[in-house]
């Protein structure tokens, strides 16, 4: 099977307020039913659509994990905003999770950062002024897949 | 080469049961969102169910929720459809299908066949 681009994100429930879509597309906050004939609403704290979409249905709302704290709860427009707990911090690379920041500097370094949920402590060397995050230098990755081509379906 | 093998259909009495598999290879497969469509004698695509890349969500279309189930293991890249409770409306040939993210009208609408796509048949009759 192979397929156009895909849009933003997407749920059905019985018995939600129904409109029509306007130029095939309906607004946040809704999705399109199956046949394509009418706006169905989120359910307000289970699931939602941010854009003007044609999603078959509203995306579920995220839960925080334990460790994270709910910044914003889920509307039928806006998903749930989930921030890692003081004193840990969520990594670009690692967003699955947030992670203890370290308590100190390596030793010949002095602390220029603090702590936040989204980066750990920030070290620099006393003489160089040479920057260095608190974690030690991770193992270099080989990168042995491709990417996906984008959005094709069938073989 | 993007390859997507299905099996595990067959013919089955109303009331049965049907466990699908489609086995990935040539992408990687927990990075997609993955579907299952359908398509009954004559009829175009229908959307069945999808599944996000790490499967902790699944959606399904009005007429199978409650009765399929839609799973994936992306160590083994499989993706999986048990489908209970068969009924003759659910008679189609079944292919599964990669994306980048949840399925939308438009999209569904515009996909195709391809021609080496053999699909597994799904054959619910008494």
């Known amino acids: 099977i192979t397929q156009q681009d895909l849009a933003p994100q997407q749920r059905v429930a019985p018995q939600q307020k129904r409109s029509s879509p306007s130029e095939g597309l309906c607004p946040p906050g809704h999705h399109i039913s199956e046949d394509g004939r009418d706006c169905i609403s989120c359910k307000y704290g289970q699931d939602y659509s941010t854009h003007w979409n044609d999603l078959l249905f509203c995306l579920r709302c995220t839960r925080c994990d334990s460790g994270e704290v709910e910044l914003s709860p889920c509307t039928t427009t806006r998903n749930t905003v989930c921030q890692c707990e003081e004193g840990t911090f969520r990594e670009e690379d690692s967003p699955e999770m947030c992670r203890k920041c370290r308590t100190g500097c390596p030793r010949g370094m002095v602390k220029v950062g603090d702590c936040t949920p989204w980066s750990d402590i920030e070290c620099v060397h006393k003489e160089s002024g040479t920057k260095h995050s608190g974690e030690a230098p991770a193992v270099e990755e080989t990168v042995t897949s491709s990417p996906g081509t984008p959005a094709s379906p069938c073989s | 080469e993007v390859q997507l093998v299905e099996s595990g259909g067959g013919l089955v009495q109303p009331g049965g049961s049907l466990r699908l598999s489609c086995a990935a290879s040539?992408?990687?497969?927990?990075r997609y969102w993955m579907y299952w469509v359908r398509q009954a004698p004559g009829k175009g695509l229908e959307w069945?169910?999808?599944?996000?890349?790490?499967?902790?969500?699944?959606y399904y279309r009005d007429s199978v929720r409650g009765r399929f189930t839609i799973s994936r293991d992306n160590f083994k890249n499989t993706l999986y459809l048990q489908m209970n409770s068969l009924k003759s409306e659910d008679t189609a040939v079944y292919y599964c299908?990669?994306?980048?993210?949840?399925?939308?009208?438009?999209?569904?609408?515009?996909?195709?066949?391809?021609?080496g796509a053999q699909g597994t048949q799904v054959t619910v009759s008494s």
């Open positions: 069945v169910s999808a599944i996000n890349s790490g499967g902790g969500d699944t």
């Open positions: 040539g992408f990687t497969f927990s």
């Open positions: 299908a990669k994306a980048e993210g949840p399925p939308t009208f438009s999209l569904i609408r515009t996909m195709t066949v391809d021609p």
